[in-house]
């Protein structure tokens, strides 16, 4: 009778020990299984979860625009006053709704190449007005022409054309014209076959970005989605030295198992450069734990503050010998046009940049860029890309429309907020397929370990108690 009880207690302790051991073993084994599954599913090839979402994003992406409406155009042109601006917006477009095209796998170097078609659909319900709303903005062609042709002879010719076309330093244009293009009356007078259509994003619709060639991760998962080449080249040919490198992914995803200590590098064709984001905080996105990576102020610093940025300073005059910060001259990438990129409202820019402009209110929360990355898969489940397009306008003695300017201005034209968030349905699916399974496995591991240990300890205590009782 005593033996039965003792045997039972020992059997219980053994079962507990087995469960605990099994739970303990399941931890590394389970992690290995998860890792194996993740590695298999994030590879960019037909049939994987990643590939399906990569070809055509499951996220609805919106691009909101705020236009800087100039309130005192005549005063600026005549007296070189501060430019008073008032932002108007948002005007919202749906973007990135087209699937990647010309997808070609290269099994030899484990890459996949593609182009990303561009398209934008106006969303009136998410906008403050229509595409026909008018704005007073800098005359893009008049500002750019003397910058491109810094030749005094040609500037005299251009002046004749500007006067003939009744163009001036500022112009009134509709949203649709400003963004997507309009026939410029001054350029239309040039008697050679040149492009006479001007627009901040012209040409956009029916164009493609790429060709991108990215690693598919088949041979090395730590390289998945990393750009191998862009437009057939490993470098951009826009910047000197290492600034010209194409680093990281396109920010839609990153190699899996993202750690907080990691710097996420990505290339953005919008700003013609590679940039990086650093860990900011942990966030719960629709029940999915994500890491919020933010673009640090350091990325926009002057070479004085961040020596790594020295090769992004390609011009000494406007940058005050590379001491100004927060604006990036991307002219080399825009056929020599004087285009400068910054954060909205000149967030993180030096005071000399924003001083000639009135009406700007930079705000970290509204104007910073961030990526919410699910750390196990490396997928970006939510993002907000914010940037501002500015045009440099300088005094030009030979051009009457610009001859009264006493200083150069980096004139804000518009800023945009491109956002995407995983949909509720997709989030549920993601939780079920990824985080849910991982959570469940973790719970099973802990339950087995917990129950096993408790059983083992309880039965062993009972056994020992029983033994001592019998001994008496």
């Amino acid at each position: 009778m005593g033996c039965d009880r003792n045997c039972g207690l020992i059997a219980g302790a053994v079962i507990g020990a087995v469960l605990a051991v099994f739970g303990g073993i399941l931890m590394p084994v389970g992690d290995m299984l998860i890792e194996k599954t993740i590695k298999r599913e994030v590879v960019l090839e037909e049939g994987t979860t990643a590939f399906k979402n990569w070809v055509k994003t499951g996220t609805t992406v919106y691009r909101q625009f705020w236009i800087f409406d100039v309130q005192n155009p005549d005063d600026v042109a005549k007296n070189s006053s501060k430019i008073k601006v008032k932002q108007r917006g948002p005007y919202t477009y749906r973007v990135r709704y087209l699937a990647k095209e010309n997808i070609t796998q290269d099994p030899e170097d484990h890459t996949v190449s593609f182009v990303q078609p561009n398209g934008a659909i106006f969303e009136p319900s998410l906008s403050v007005g229509t595409e026909d709303d008018n704005f007073t903005v800098l005359n893009l062609a008049v500002a750019a022409a003397p910058h491109i042709y810094q030749n005094s002879f040609v500037q005299v010719v251009l002046n004749s054309l500007i006067k003939k076309s009744k163009s001036s330093m500022f112009q009134t244009r509709s949203l649709k014209e400003l963004l997507w293009g309009y026939k410029d009356p001054f350029l239309s007078l040039v008697p050679y076959p040149i492009s006479t259509t001007v627009g901040v994003f012209y040409p956009y619709n029916d164009t493609v970005d790429g060709v991108y060639k990215v690693f598919n991760g088949k041979d090395n998962i730590s390289k998945v989605a990393i750009i191998e080449s862009y437009k057939g080249k490993r470098n951009l040919s826009y910047w000197p030295s290492y600034c010209d490198m194409i680093n990281g992914t396109d920010a839609a995803s990153f190699p899996p198992f993202v750690e907080k200590s990691r710097t996420l590098r990505f290339f953005s064709s919008d700003i013609c450069r590679s940039i990086y984001a650093v860990f900011g905080s942990e966030i719960d996105l629709k029940g999915i734990p994500v890491y919020r990576f933010v673009l640090p102020a350091n990325a926009f610093a002057s070479p004085l503050q961040n020596p790594d940025n020295h090769c992004f300073c390609t011009e000494k005059v406007i940058s005050n010998n590379c001491t100004s910060y927060g604006v990036l001259d991307i002219g080399k990438c825009k056929e020599g046009k004087p285009v400068y990129i910054s954060l909205p409202h000149f967030l993180h820019a030096s005071p000399d940049v924003s001083e000639p402009i009135e009406g700007l209110h930079p705000n970290e929360d509204e104007h910073r860029t961030y990526l919410d990355v699910e750390p196990i898969t490396g997928f970006t489940l939510q993002f907000a890309k914010r940037l501002q397009v500015n045009i440099l306008v300088k005094p030009a003695r030979k051009i009457e429309a610009l001859k009264n300017l006493k200083r150069p201005y980096i004139v804000p034209i518009l800023w945009l907020n491109e956002t995407g968030t995983i949909g509720d349905e997709k989030a549920e699916m993601f939780k079920t397929q990824v985080t849910g399974k991982i959570k469940l496995l973790g719970m099973v591991e802990m339950a087995l370990l917990g129950i096993g240990v408790v059983m083992f300890v309880a039965f062993m205590i009972s056994y020992c108690a029983c033994k001592s009782k019998n001994g008496k």
Epitope: N151, F153, S160, K164, V190, P191
Partner: antibody, heavy 117, light 107 residues
Framework: EVQLVESGGGLVQPGGSLRLSCAAS????????IHWVRQAPGKGLEWVAW????????YYADSVKGRFTISADTSKNTAYLQMNSLRAEDTAVYYC??????????WGQGTLVTVSS | DIQMTQSPSSLSASVGDRVTITCRAS??????VAWYQQKPGKAPKLLIS???SLYSGVPSRFSGSGSGTDFTLTISSLQPEDFATYYC?????????FGQGTKVEIK
């Protein structure tokens, strides 16, 4: 086909006047602007005057400033060079030429102006 | 005014020779230089604009190089019809100015 034809050259006494014409076809002079370039016998090319597009500004070489006047009649698609107070050193073949960006892609055949007593 | 100094003022060469003519500007004219060919009794003909851009219809044996103040016209293999006088011209600033010319003669 683009063509420029000069006329009006000839023999003139020092201090005299002459008006050269440059008739253009195949393009509108208004949208390009017209230059006059001269070449003294056995010498090199010398830029003389320019009328910018759309009746824009006029520019002259220092050697002719105040004596020569360039003009254009857009209805006739013709440019003119009015030459007053002519001197012996103004003796040359005068070419009209088309230019937009400052290089001359089309030239006339030239008209000879001789200033001699 | 910007002075354009051409060298040599004349040269003798044979058919098939490679010929180089240089032109120096008295100040930086970027790439705003044109080259012309002129035969006796004829108007000049444009060969090259923007220092390096071959004008349409001009044979590819003609090429231009240079930027800033030093420019070169090269004829890779001289042909009988290439014997003429060549002029450089800056089209950066008014007054537009020409070099004094280089006469290419038969050896």
């Amino acid at each position: 086909e683009v063509q420029l034809v000069e006329s009006g050259g000839g023999l003139v006494q020092p201090g005299g006047s002459l008006r050269l014409s440059c008739a253009a076809s195949g393009f509108t002079i208004d949208s390009f602007g017209i230059h006059w370039v001269r070449q003294a016998p056995g010498k090199g090319l010398e830029w003389v005057a320019w009328i910018a597009p759309y009746g824009g500004e006029t520019y002259y070489a220092d050697s002719v400033k105040g004596r020569f006047t360039i003009s254009a009649d857009t209805s006739k698609n013709t440019a003119y060079l009015q030459m007053n107070s002519l001197r012996a050193e103004d003796t040359a073949v005068y070419y009209c030429a088309r230019s937009f960006f400052g290089y001359f892609d089309y030239w006339g055949q030239g008209t000879l102006v001789t200033v001699s007593s | 005014d910007i002075q354009m100094t051409q060298s040599p003022s004349s040269l003798s060469a044979s058919v098939g020779d490679r010929v180089t003519i240089t032109c120096r500007a008295s100040q930086d004219v970027s790439n705003w230089v044109a080259w012309y060919q002129q035969k006796p009794g004829k108007a000049p003909k444009l060969l090259i604009s923007y220092a390096t851009s071959l004008y349409s219809g001009v044979p590819s044996r003609f090429s231009g190089s240079g930027s800033g103040t030093d420019f070169t016209l090269t004829i890779s293999s001289l042909q009988p019809e290439d014997f003429a006088t060549y002029y450089c011209q800056q089209h950066s600033n008014a007054p537009l100015t020409f070099g004094q010319g280089t006469k290419v003669e038969i050896k």
